[in-house]
């Protein structure tokens, strides 16, 4: 039951998660105008990964495309890449996800081809959730960096009267979503990778060992492969089905005897 | 055919209140940001207030802020300008100006404007 | 706050006469993140309220002569009427729509 439960939360908290990066690709307040200086501007600058807008006091917003592609800074085309490759892999993730769900049975699919669908999804959510943070904090990190040099070139034109203000940037809320976005990715990759060794099979242990006289090579190890990997043993009793050993998340579900779905 | 209409203005004492008026007609009132523009007797125009459509927000000049107020009621059509504590430098033709959606915050239509004389 | 410098005060002209009329802000009108201008121009007749002439600069209101032609970037801004007629006769405001308060000239007279 407990493997179901990690497995199910996994998805959904990587579904959660994903939606979130690609709501965050999506969105036009990566960065906003600073309003330290000027708390009250009548126009208000804010940009994206795709297109910047002009927030006017009249209620009109108008954007405008970046539909220049070599003219991008390479750091903003990095970003863009990162958070692109990070919703591929989370979307074919969740895909893979669903079929691999312990609830849910496709025909005759062995367990162990669901343990295989299971760790290979959280590695996806992982390093989906890791390209959307890696992402971000590029996008972040540059923008810190601007920040800094605009306001060290704040005013220009100091001799005359006339002063020429830089509009500084600071961070947007899309930021915030791809942090906690990718976040959630990551921790639901983990998740399913947990419930992927909760998953996977004991026939191949059980196959390998002869029960033969004491004097055969191969020690017999009740908890099976469970006992060699760290899981702790298992001394209960197997259910014995086609001729090899299978049970269903027998140290998660403990103390109930059997999880079936 | 856009028509804004100012009211309220009159003669009144040093310390004393005004509440002005302007109805709005001949376009979509919620949608739009409005503004109050006063002109001194010298004939300078002086930005007084402005309120964004939903009335979220409003903006004044510094001379007048805490002393006036700025509302608006979408479904009259009408916006109020609350003014307490005059000065005699709050004497001035009061318009009504509204905001163009995509006219760069500049105001394209105005009313006649009424008239506020602060004087003991 | 933003200074609206407008020059002259006042202008005497004949009709069919070619003006232009100055403003200067005393900082950057232009936003970066559009590249827009946001300084308007109007018009204002004896005994009615100012006229929305020019928006974003140049921008010409619709029903505007195209005898009107506003130019200019950044802090220096210029209002032309390429030949005078006699209804032109009227003060000329600029304004700084840019930045809260949205501040204007002292005004240009243009008189016969």
């Known amino acids: 039951m407990a493997v179901t439960a990690c497995q199910g939360l996994g998805f959904v908290v990587s579904l959660i998660g994903i939606a979130g990066i690609i709501a965050a690709t999506c969105m036009d307040q990566w960065s906003t105008q600073d309003l330290y200086n000027n708390p009250v501007t009548a126009v208000f600058n804010y940009q994206g990964l795709w297109r910047s807008c002009v927030r006017e006091s009249s209620g009109f917003t108008e954007c405008r495309g970046y539909f220049t592609l070599l003219g991008l800074p390479a750091m903003l085309q990095a970003v863009r890449a990162l958070m692109i490759v990070g919703i591929v892999l989370g979307a074919i993730g969740l895909l893979v996800s669903i079929f691999a769900l312990k609830c849910i049975r496709i025909g005759s699919m062995e367990d162990s081809a669901k343990a295989n669908m299971t760790l290979t999804s959280g590695i996806m959510f992982i390093v989906s959730g890791l390209c959307a943070i890696a992402g971000v904090s590029v996008f972040a990190n540059m923008l810190v960096t601007n920040f800094w040099m605009s306001t060290a070139n704040m005013y220009t034109g100091m001799g005359g009267m006339v002063q020429t203000v830089q509009t500084r940037y600071t961070f947007g809320a899309a930021l915030f979503v791809g942090w906690v976005a990718g976040g959630l990715t990551l921790i639901g990759g983990v998740m399913m990778c947990i419930a992927c060794r909760g998953l996977a099979p004991e026939e191949t242990n059980y196959k390998a060992v002869s029960y033969h006289a004491s004097g055969h090579s191969v020690a017999y190890k009740p908890g099976g492969f469970k006992a060699s990997t760290g899981f702790g043993s298992n001394t209960k009793n197997k259910k014995i089905y086609d001729g090899g050993a299978r049970t269903e998340d027998e140290v998660q579900s403990y103390p109930s005897k059997h999880d079936y779905v | 055919e856009v028509m804004l209409v100012e009211s309220g203005g009159g003669l009144v004492k040093p310390g004393g209140s005004l509440k002005l008026s302007c109805t709005a007609s001949?376009?979509?009132?919620?949608?739009?940001?409005m503004s109050w523009v006063r002109q001194t007797p010298e004939k300078r125009l002086e930005w007084v207030a402005t309120?964004?459509?939903?009335?979220?927000?409003?903006y004044f000049l510094d001379s007048v802020k805490g002393r006036f107020t700025f509302s608006r009621d979408n479904a009259k059509n009408a916006l109020y300008l609350q003014m307490n504590s005059l000065r005699s430098e709050d004497t001035a033709l009061y318009y009504c100006?509204?905001?163009?959606?995509?006219?760069?915050?500049?105001?394209?239509?105005w009313g006649q404007g009424t008239s506020v004389t602060v004087s003991s | 706050d933003i200074v609206m410098t407008q020059s002259p005060s006042s202008l005497s002209v004949s009709a069919g006469e070619k003006v232009t009329m100055s403003c200067k802000s005393s900082?950057?009108?232009?936003?970066?993140?559009?590249?827009?201008?946001?300084l308007a121009w109007y018009q204002q007749k004896p005994g009615q309220p100012p006229k929305l002439l020019i928006y974003g600069a140049s921008t010409r209101e619709s029903g505007v002569p195209d005898r009107f032609t506003g130019s200019g970037s950044g802090t220096d801004f210029t209002l032309t009427i390429s030949s005078v007629q006699a209804e032109d006769l009227a003060i000329y405001y600029c304004q700084n729509d840019h930045t809260y308060p949205l501040t204007f000239g002292a005004g240009t007279k243009l008189e016969l």
């Open positions: 001949g376009f979509t009132f919620r949608s739009y940001t």
């Open positions: 309120i964004t459509g939903g009335g979220g927000n409003t």
């Open positions: 900082q950057s009108l232009l936003n970066s993140g559009n590249q827009m201008n946001y």
């Open positions: 100006a509204r905001l163009g959606q995509t006219q760069r915050n500049a105001m394209d239509y």
